[in-house]
């Protein structure tokens, strides 16, 4: 069953999935001036048995120099503040990944693929929050956010953090500090779209990743 | 609940034009994938093409191109399919769907009947 | 593109008989993007099963579906008087999706 909304938004904070839950379809978006190939996906998904989970389908681009055939539209205002939009970095994989059963690790980047990842979660998918470079977390709880099936729809869980003051650096290095939503605003009006980059994550970490996730290091 | 309301019958000439609308409601129409499908009196489904309102990315069907145009509003949650160049072949049903796990959710479809 | 042959293209069958369909594609597809879709007379289609053997919301657990590669088959294990529609397979791997041509399936 897929999320119908996004995970709340924490001011001065970031969300990552560490893994996939089986099901997440992943948008084949391709940079500008590019386009899908012909016979190419509108995504990919995550699959698989109990052993074994990877992603389904290839995403491809290619050049719409001659015939641009997939039209990028610049977002509105209001629309931007929905797309949460995270420039991609170099991809290494998280190792504890593999360890996760019924998750596909980060999907390796494609050629030509947009700057921002398109995420369709799941019923289950778990994220993680971090504070933005020049702010510090103040811990409630786990700041972590599942998505969760309640009375036939599905809800976000509300993460337990604040990110205050300055002190700290970001632990998602390279990051731009993201536009703070307004406080207070509410889960239901969060979108589904997900964007999100690869973490890069230096140390192994548990697989049952809890909050230990923001002792490790990250490069 | 989910729910796909398309615009109503539309009776048009040879050579004109014409604009049908799919209103989504019941969930959030930014993201999911849009698909337009076509079904004549007595045949089986043909796929359009598809639309993403949350960046406007689409893809037809090569038979379709230059006779369907996809547009959405996000701001209205409304898809729109412009038909141009009518003739009697395009006198069909025409369906939106949303793509979830499968195309999990229909419109009602809306009717167009070219005649002069 | 990638084009799906139903089979039998008709069929008459009596409550309580168990129905099978199939599809068969004319080259590999991944059975995540395999979907079969019911149409009652007047109706919009309707999703029945998706991902070639989950069963859609509200769907009786008569409906079954299995195949791999470039088979595919949908089952009513106990036809019923409500099952009499046309059935349609579809395919999402690759652009265009392509619907099958469908199966009518008609009380005896």
């Known amino acids: 069953e897929l999320c119908d909304d996004d995970p709340p938004e924490i001011p001065h904070a970031t969300f990552k999935a560490m893994a996939y839950k089986e099901g997440t379809m992943l948008n084949c978006e391709c940079k500008r001036g590019f386009r899908r190939i012909k016979s190419g996906s509108l995504y990919m998904l995550c699959t698989g048995n109990s052993s074994h989970s990877s992603w389904d389908n290839q995403c491809q681009c290619t050049s719409s120099a001659t015939r641009n055939t997939t039209k990028q539209v610049t977002p509105q205002p209001e629309e931007q503040k929905e797309r949460k939009t995270t420039e991609m970095q170099s991809p290494m994989q998280p190792v504890d990944q593999a360890s996760l059963p019924g998750h596909c690790r980060e999907p390796p980047p494609w050629e030509n693929e947009a700057t921002e990842r398109i995420y369709h979660f799941v019923v289950g998918q778990m994220v993680y929050y971090q504070c933005v470079q020049g702010y510090r977390a103040l811990h409630r709880g786990p700041a972590e956010s599942v998505c969760k099936m309640t009375h036939g729809k599905t809800r976000w869980t509300q993460p337990q953090l604040i990110c205050t003051g300055e002190m700290e650096t970001s632990q998602f290095p390279g990051e731009e500090k993201p536009q703070a939503s307004p406080e207070g605003r509410p889960e239901s009006e969060t979108s589904c779209l997900v964007t999100t980059t690869d973490f890069q994550i230096q140390t192994e970490m548990a697989a049952t990743m809890e909050t230990s996730i923001f002792t490790t290091e990250y490069q | 609940q989910v729910k796909l309301q398309q615009s109503g019958t539309v009776l048009a000439r040879p050579g004109a034009s014409v604009k049908m609308s799919c209103k989504a409601s019941g969930y959030r129409f930014t993201n999911y994938w849009m698909h337009w499908v076509k079904q004549r009196p007595g045949q089986g489904l043909e796929w359009i093409g598809v639309i993403y309102p949350g960046n406007s990315d689409t893809s037809y069907n090569q038979k379709f191109k230059g006779k369907a145009k996809l547009t959405a509003v996000t701001s209205a949650s409304t898809a729109y399919m412009e038909l141009s160049s009518l003739t009697n072949e395009d006198s069909a049903v025409y369906y939106c769907?949303?793509?979830?796990?499968?195309?999990?959710?229909w419109g009602q479809g809306t009717t167009v009947t070219v005649s002069s | 593109q990638i084009v799906l042959t139903q089979s039998p293209a008709t069929m008459a069958a009596s409550p309580g008989e168990k129905i099978t369909i199939t599809c068969s594609a004319s080259s590999s597809i991944s059975s995540n993007y395999l979907h079969w879709y019911q149409q009652k007379p007047g109706f919009s289609p309707k999703l029945l099963i998706y991902?070639?053997?989950n069963l859609a919301s509200g769907v009786p657990a008569r409906f079954s579906g299995s195949g791999s590669g470039t088979s595919y088959s949908l089952t009513i294990g106990t036809m019923e008087a409500e099952d009499v529609a046309t059935y349609y397979c579809?395919?999402?791997?690759?652009?265009?999706?392509?619907f099958g041509g469908g199966t009518k399936l008609e009380l005896k």
């Open positions: 579809q395919q999402g791997s690759s652009i265009p999706y392509t």
């Open positions: 991902r070639t053997s």
């Open positions: 769907t949303r793509e979830g796990e499968g195309s999990d959710y």
